[in-house]
Interface confidence: low
């Protein structure tokens, strides 16, 4: 499950449920 980007969502975060593979981890989105 990917979280929807918004203006407050940083490009890279340590997060849960936002990566394409990890449930939690350091996730970078381009």
């Amino acid at each position: 499950r990917r979280r929807r980007r918004d203006t407050h969502f940083p490009i890279c975060i340590f997060c849960c449920g936002c990566c394409h593979r990890s449930k939690c981890g350091m996730c970078c989105k381009t």
């Epitope: 890279c12 939690c24 981890g25």
Partner: antibody
């Protein structure tokens, strides 16, 4: 070719601040989706993830050590840094830096490329 | 923190043996598990990521399986160069490593 190399003080005393440097080549921390992590391994023991920094300066820390850790980077010199405050003998370990796998902009904590490690001893 | 328990801690096997290493998580980590090989004096090397994906350049005798809390690393035919310590690593939440399984030749 991706390479990483750690450097540090070798020996320091309890209560001091440990400063570590990871110098790398073959990739840039200004590239989208690239991150660098620090991991340590006490002599003869297991591995412990410490911190991760990514290309646009976001950071993740091990919760149990977060108040003692600071990760940073110097993009132009291809370096990442880790500071650990108030060190104790329990911080004696080999310290590794590593680069997680990168999936075209998605970088997670699947640590792929590792440096050879630097031994740090805390002793009075 | 999620605890990772590896068994056995020491395993002796012969060349050509099929070897199975176990890793158990204290709670559900889905498939967010890697296996690393560490030879004496060297840095860890990624063998398997996301439970069963073989990292590039790793021999096909290595395979991984599992889901949830129980995971396995299998070496289908043990080779002398496989002598090492093997660590599992979860990155589902607050990344943690297991204590390792030391694999030696009989």
């Amino acid at each position: 070719q991706v390479t990483l190399k750690e450097s540090g003080p070798g020996i320091l005393q309890p209560s001091q601040t440990l400063s570590l440097t990871c110098s790398f080549s073959g990739f840039s921390l200004s590239t989208s989706g690239i991150c660098v992590s620090w991991i340590r391994q006490p002599s003869g023991k297991g591995l412990e993830w410490l911190a991760t920094i990514c290309w646009e300066d976001s950071k993740g820390y091990n919760p149990s050590l977060k108040n003692r850790l600071t990760i940073s980077k110097d993009t132009s010199n291809n370096q990442a840094f880790l500071k650990i405050t108030s060190v104790d003998t329990a911080d004696t370990a080999i310290y590794y830096c590593a680069r997680p796998l990168n999936y075209g902009g998605y970088s997670e904590l699947e640590l792929d490329y590792w440096g050879q490690g630097v031994m740090v001893t805390v002793s009075s | 923190d999620i605890q990772m328990t590896q068994s056995p801690s020491l395993l002796s096997a012969s060349v050509g043996d099929r070897v199975t290493l176990s890793c158990k998580a204290s709670q559900n980590i889905y498939k967010y598990l890697n296996w690393y090989q560490q030879k004496l004096g060297e840095a860890p090397k990624l063998l398997i990521y996301y439970t069963n994906s073989l990292q590039t350049g790793i021999p096909s005798r290595f395979s991984g399986s599992g889901s949830g809390t129980d995971f396995t690393l299998t070496i289908s035919s043990l080779q002398p160069e496989d002598v090492a310590t093997y660590y599992c690593y979860q990155y589902n939440s607050g990344p943690t490593f297991g204590a390792g399984t030391k694999l030696e030749l009989k």
